[in-house]
Structure formats: C-alpha cells, structure tokens
Interface confidence: medium
C-alpha cells in the first residue's frame, strides 16, 4: 500500500534521542592539581582529557528542569604524567625533582538523568 | 638504547588533546518553544537534539579560566516536527489543528576557545 512504500519520519525516535543522547559522557579537561587536591606539586601536562557526564536531561520528560545529569557508572583510569616537586636551593635557583608518575582520574562511563519528584520553585 | 626501545608516553599529545578536544560540539536537547520563542504553540517532540559547543577550554593555556568555549561555525538545520495550535471550542473540548512544520535550529559545527587577554579578578 501507499503507507508501506513511503519513507517515514519517526518523531518518536527523535523524541527518544533528545532524552537518551543529551546526557552522555563527553570530553572535559581537568586540572590535575585541582582534581588531586595537591598544592605543592606541578604536573605536565597541567590538564588531561577525561570523560565526564554532561549535556542536559531530555526535556521531553516531566519536570525536566529539575533533572540533573549524573554519572551512572564511574571508573578510575590511570594516566602517566610528569610530576615536578620543588627541591633544595641550588646555585642556579630552585631545582625540581622530576618523575613519571601514574595518577588515577575518574571517568564517567554511563550517565543517568536524576529527576526530583517535583520541579524547582 | 633503553629510551628508544621503551614505548614513549607522548605527554605533548596529551597536553594538546586537553586543549583541542575539551571544547567541541556535543549533544544538547533544546526545548523548541523556548528556542523559537513561541508561546501559544505546542510541538511534538517538545525537544530536539542539537549540536552545541560545550566542555571547557583546555586548561593548559595561559589564563585558561578566562576562556570561553564558543561556536566557531554555526549552521542552521531543518527539523520536521508536529505543531499543534489551540483551535476553537468544540463539544468534546478544545480542538487543535496539527501541522507538520520544518523548523530551523542552530547547530555548532566547530568550537573555538575565546580567551580574554587577562584573567578574571
């Protein structure tokens, strides 16, 4: 019939996509010192790319404005970086000891929309 | 030598990645009524997935805290949606006329980090 032969636009799928794919893991750069809460250390690179939940929650849901996009599964991943620590005074100024270290940063593997039962005031 | 044989950790590449891939086009759901600033119309779906710049600017840059992730190239894309408009009162309640409409929404194709010359106070 006419209906079988025609190409269709699936609005339900578009609606689902807005809900499903707007809150997903995505790239963010994090400052290693801030992330590890270390003040007296310098890293190279200063920042690393991590996967963190972001975007917004598909606004097709009821009370969508009261929803937040949170991690549903977090894993710790190792990253190799150079760590510099202030050393002793030398003739040519402050020396730094350098080491290649493995640090662990949180990566979000799955994201969920967490919605409060009632919208914000 | 030992250094040649050992697989190198390319820290420069990690540094570049943090700058390059943290500010990129990513999925966001937008409320069509809000986006088009239309009050007396209802759409299905209410929301659509669009590509908008997001993330943060690679914090390896100087004054990275004063940088914002903005669209470097924006294109308008068509989306088919159903538009309902309140009709006249009928016996069985308020009638709605329905139309399939093509709306245009902004999609960000490229993102740039725009940094002010000095950091915020």
């Amino acid at each position: 019939s006419y209906h079988d032969r025609k190409s269709k636009v699936d609005l339900d799928r578009l609606n689902d996509d807005a809900k499903r794919y707007s809150c997903t893991p995505r790239n963010y750069s994090v400052n290693i010192r801030e992330e590890l809460k270390l003040a007296n250390v310098v890293f190279f690179p200063r920042c690393l790319l991590v996967q963190r939940c972001g975007g917004n929650c598909g606004c097709g849901t009821v009370n969508w404005r009261s929803c937040t996009c949170n991690s549903g599964k977090t894993v710790k991943k190792y990253h190799e970086v150079l760590q510099f620590e202030p050393g002793h005074i030398k003739r040519r100024g402050r020396a730094k000891t350098m080491a290649l270290v493995d640090i662990q940063l949180d990566h979000h593997e799955r994201c969920d929309c967490i919605c409060s039962s009632r919208p914000p005031r | 030598s030992y250094h040649d044989r050992k697989s190198k950790v390319d820290l420069d590449r990690l540094n570049d990645d943090a700058k390059r891939y943290s500010c990129t086009p990513r999925n966001y759901s937008v409320n069509i009524r809000e986006e088009l600033k239309l009050a007396n119309v209802v759409f299905f779906p209410r929301c659509l997935l669009v590509q908008r710049c997001g993330g943060n600017c690679g914090c390896g840059t100087v004054n990275w805290r004063s940088c914002t992730c903005n669209s470097g190239k924006t294109v308008k894309k068509y989306h088919e949606v159903l538009q309902f408009e309140p009709g006249h009162i009928k016996r069985r309640g308020r009638a709605k006329t329905m139309a399939l409409v093509d709306i245009q929404l902004d999609h960000h194709e490229r993102c740039d980090c725009i940094c002010s010359s000095r950091p915020p106070r």
Epitope: S1, D10 | L100
Partner: antibody, heavy 126, light 107 residues
Framework: EVQLVESGGGLVKPGGSLRLSCAAS????????MNWVRQAPGKGLEWVSS????????YYADSVKGRFTISRDNAKNSLYLQMNSLRAEDTAVYYC???????????????????WGQGTLVTVSS | DIQMTQSPSSLSASVGDRVTITCRAS??????LGWFQQKPGKAPKRLIY???SLQSGVPSRFSGSGSGTEFTLTISSLQPEDFATYYC?????????FGGGTKVEIK
C-alpha cells in the same frame, strides 16, 4: 517559508520533449516525497507521478508510463519531470507538491500535498 | 485502481448556507483522504487531511467526516470567499486518484 516553484513549461509539438523543474526551499527537501499533478484546461486534477525521498520508489499514472520520467536532486533541492513523446492530451498546468509520512505515538500520519507550486503550463500543439 | 466518485459535480448556494459535498471510494481506503479547494488560476489548497483533520490556518467552518468508502466535506456557513471548486484525493494506494471536483457557485 515553504516554497515550490515550477519552471520549464512552454509550447511543444506533438512527439516533442520538455523537462520541467520544481525548485524547493524553506523545508528539508531530502526527507519529503515529491509529486507531479496536472490539470488540463477546464478539467479536474490528475496525479502524474511520485518519487520517494531517496528516489528508491517511483510511481507513474498509466497515462504517462514509459513516456515521463520523474527524478530529483536532493543536493540542489530540485524535482524534475522529463516528458518525452508528448501528446495533445498532455496539455495542462503541471504542479509539484510535497508529501511525507510520520510516525508518532504509534500513529502513522500522512502529510501529503500540503504545499503546491504555482504551476507551469505545458501546451502540446502543432 | 481506486475510483473516487464525487458529487454533486456542481451546486448553487447562498452566503450563510450549509453545504455538503461527498466522495465515494470504489474500495475501502481507511481515512486516507484529503479535501482541497481551488480557485481559478490558482494552485489547489489543502483544507482537510486524514478525512477529518483540519489543516492549520483553515477556518473552522470547514469540516470533514467519514471512513472506509464514504466521505463528506461540510461548510457550515458558506462565505463569499468559499466559492470555488473542491476536490477529494485518496492516497491509500497508487495510483493516487482525485475526485472529479465540485464547483460551488453563487445562487
């Protein structure tokens, strides 16, 4: 604003050829099925041909089958009708019109012939 | 092929009259039918789709009803701008077919 603009009509001798074009704007042409409809002077409307969004399905009225060819160029937002072996009875105003089918909430809804072009006149006469 | 028989082929009516036009399909077409209005020298304009749904922007004095093989277009109170020719169209199966048209004239 949705617009369909036909062109290419004119006077042609029986047995001759013409190519009609329909330029589309203001909507996502590549997702719509497109149609040609004609109207002979003082007569009613007659469906001529349809083409699906990706050109995978094409249909013709028996009266034009084997003589007319419908095609589209989604990159150019254009619909075409190649008319060969024209006859006097092909004299008409030719309109292009769009149609689409959508599914939502388990319902299939057809939005067909909601926008038409202004028409282009084809006259087949010796 | 599905034949669409439209009646009457013409009618005369006055402003304010209630006008009814019918279309009969030679076989069941569910609600896959639309109604169009055409004025001289102009392209057709869709009034009703899916047998009974009013096209956005069309006055509510126009209404459609029916399913299967019998369909009706009603103009509840004829206005001066409604004098035109009206066509039904079935899109249940190819070839798509129009009714023969109904010319609504001023009495």
């Amino acid at each position: 604003e949705v617009q369909l603009v036909e062109s290419g009509g004119g006077l042609v001798k029986p047995g001759g050829s013409l190519r009609l074009s329909c330029a589309a704007s203001g909507f996502n042409f590549r997702t719509y099925n497109m149609n040609w409809v004609r109207q002979a002077p003082g007569k009613g409307l007659e469906w001529v041909s349809s083409i699906s969004s990706s050109s995978s399905n094409i249909y013709y009225a028996d009266s034009v089958k084997g003589r007319f060819t419908i095609s589209r160029d989604n990159a150019k937002n254009s619909l075409y009708l190649q008319m060969n072996s024209l006859r006097a009875e092909d004299t008409a105003v030719y309109y292009c019109a769009r149609d689409i089918m959508i599914t939502f909430g388990g319902i299939i809804a057809s939005f067909y012939f909601d926008y038409w072009g202004q028409g282009t006149l084809v006259t087949v006469s010796s | 092929d599905i034949q669409m028989t439209q009646s009457p082929s013409s009618l005369s009516a006055s402003v304010g009259d209630r006008v009814t036009i019918t279309c009969r399909a030679s076989q069941g077409i569910r609600n896959d039918l639309g109604w169009f209005q055409q004025k001289p020298g102009k392209a057709p304009k869709r009034l009703i789709y899916a047998a009974s749904s009013l096209q956005s922007g069309v006055p509510s004095r126009f209404s459609g009803s029916g399913s299967g093989t019998e369909f009706t277009l009603t103009i509840s109170s004829l206005q001066p701008e409604d004098f035109a020719t009206y066509y039904c169209l079935q899109h249940n199966s190819y070839p798509l077919t129009f009714g023969g048209g109904t010319k609504v004239e001023i009495k």
